[in-house]
Interface confidence: medium
């Protein structure tokens, strides 16, 4: 079998064998090597010479196989925009940011650029769980049967109603979507407002 060409090699159809790690250089009609993540093009290829790559300097990065002549500058997560760092910048990866707790991404351009405070969910509701935290504003859904939530909050979850019998108590008032069950000692008299009803 014929040996595989090593970059730089001529390409008449403007395509290269390995699209990820090679690129077509139209000036010379050749395929040249891309530089691996964490590096940049230090010297461009020619008919004789393949691309020469060099490591990105501190505080800069290139994430992909590339033919960039510079590395991208690492940028911090901007707290003014509601962002916080979850992983530092490396030569191969930009700083990883996310919205601060209690915030959601309000502006997205390939990555989140601006976070805003999550809306409160009123009593009797909770924020619908999302696949990814901070991806969107709260969508409030009613507490399911047997659960309650009694605050206006962006993050409070509906809790199950207390089962009085589990505590050796009896139910004094049933729970609602906005309040927990009221329990009482079985030997205690009923509250005054309920006593008339009981006598009847």
């Amino acid at each position: 079998s014929q040996p595989q060409a090593v970059p730089p090699y001529a390409s008449e159809n403007q395509t290269c064998r390995d699209q990820e790690k090679e690129y077509y250089e139209p000036q010379h009609r050749i395929c040249c090597s891309r530089c691996p993540p964490g590096t940049y093009v230090s010297a461009k290829c020619s008919r004789i010479r393949d691309t020469v790559c060099a490591t990105c300097a501190e505080n800069s990065y290139n994430e992909h196989w590339n033919y960039l002549t510079i590395c991208q500058l690492c940028r911090p997560c901007d707290p003014v925009m509601g962002l916080e760092e979850i992983a530092p910048c490396t030569s191969k990866r930009k700083t990883q940011c996310r919205c601060q707790p209690g915030m959601f991404c309000a502006a997205w351009a390939l990555e989140c650029t601006h976070c805003e405070l999550l809306s409160d969910c009123p009593p009797g509701t909770e924020a619908e769980l999302k696949d990814e935290v901070g991806k969107g504003n709260n969508h409030c859904v009613p507490c399911k049967a047997g659960h309650f939530q009694n605050t206006s909050s962006p993050s409070a979850r509906c809790q199950p109603h207390t089962r009085c019998e589990n505590q050796g108590l009896v139910e004094a008032a049933p729970g609602t979507a906005q309040s927990d069950t009221t329990c009482k000692n079985p030997l205690e008299p009923l509250p005054p407002e309920m006593s008339g009803t009981m006598l009847m």
Epitope: A43, I48, R49, V52
Partner: antibody
Framework: QVQLQESGPGLVKPSQTLSLTCTVS??????????WSWIRQHPGKGLEWIGF???????YYNPSLQSRVTISVDTSKNQFSLKLNSVTAADTAVYYC????????????WGQGTMVTVSS | QSALTQPASVSGSPGQSITISCTGT?????????VSWYQQHPGKAPKFMIY???VRPSGVSNRFSGSKSGNTAYLTISGLQAEDEADYYC??????????FGGGTKLTVL
């Protein structure tokens, strides 16, 4: 601006090794993009490309000379060097060092050249 | 590989135009737009004049121009001046991953 200056013995005995150095001034040999080259010119004749080097040590040689030639670089001295072994009278020539345009293989800046005679 | 073929000499009077040819083969001049030209005055180093057949580096007079047809590249000098008197060399990439120069042309300004 960048200037190049060749230096080395003007007379070398047959079968010995020809050694020349090119000193780069007015700029860094480690500048991104620039390869550096040796070219020679036989008396009264045309030019012959010998090879390229990058400051990282990457080299490319003329296939007809590859078995005898070594080009090296010393970034601390801003110099690159040529060694040509097993020389004969046919290696008598003016030897030039030159800078290579990024992404091209054309020689934009040349040294003034140094004459090397191979004779016993 | 053999050198590219250039005429040994050409001449012209001041103000005239002259053209120097550089003939190669299908595997060098004919295949690639990678021809460069160099001017060399006696006892001096070559000077870079043209690359990629037609591209003139900054600082080189626009009286110098390059072209190519088939396997032959051309250097044209218009409005010939006394200081243009020199040797001119073409250079081309060849398939064997090397570079080859022409034998040189002596230009005489009459």
């Amino acid at each position: 601006q960048v200037q190049l200056q060749e230096s080395g013995p003007g007379l070398v005995k047959p079968s010995q090794t020809l050694s020349l150095t090119c000193t780069v001034s007015g700029g860094s040999i480690s500048s991104d993009g620039y390869f550096w080259s040796w070219i020679r010119q036989h008396p009264g004749k045309g030019l012959e490309w010998i090879g390229f080097i990058y400051f990282t040590g990457i080299t490319y040689y003329n296939p007809s000379l590859q078995s005898r030639v070594t080009i090296s670089v010393d970034t601390s001295k801003n110099q690159f060097s040529l060694k040509l072994n097993s020389v004969t009278a046919a290696d008598t020539a003016v030897y030039y060092c030159a800078r290579v345009i990024p992404g091209e293989d054309a020689f934009d800046i040349w040294g003034q050249g140094t004459m090397v005679t191979v004779s016993s | 590989q053999s050198a590219l073929t250039q005429p040994a000499s050409v001449s012209g009077s001041p103000g005239q135009s002259i053209t120097i040819s550089c003939t190669g083969t299908n595997s060098d001049v004919g295949s690639y737009n990678l021809v460069s030209w160099y001017q060399q005055h006696p006892g001096k180093a070559p000077k870079f004049m043209i690359y990629e057949v037609t591209v003139r580096p900054s600082g080189v007079s626009n009286r110098f121009s390059g072209s190519k047809s088939g396997n032959t590249a051309y250097l044209t000098i218009s409005g010939l001046q006394a200081e243009d008197e020199a040797d001119y060399y073409c250079c081309s990439y060849v398939d064997s991953k090397t570079w080859v120069f022409g034998g040189g042309t002596k230009l005489t300004v009459l």
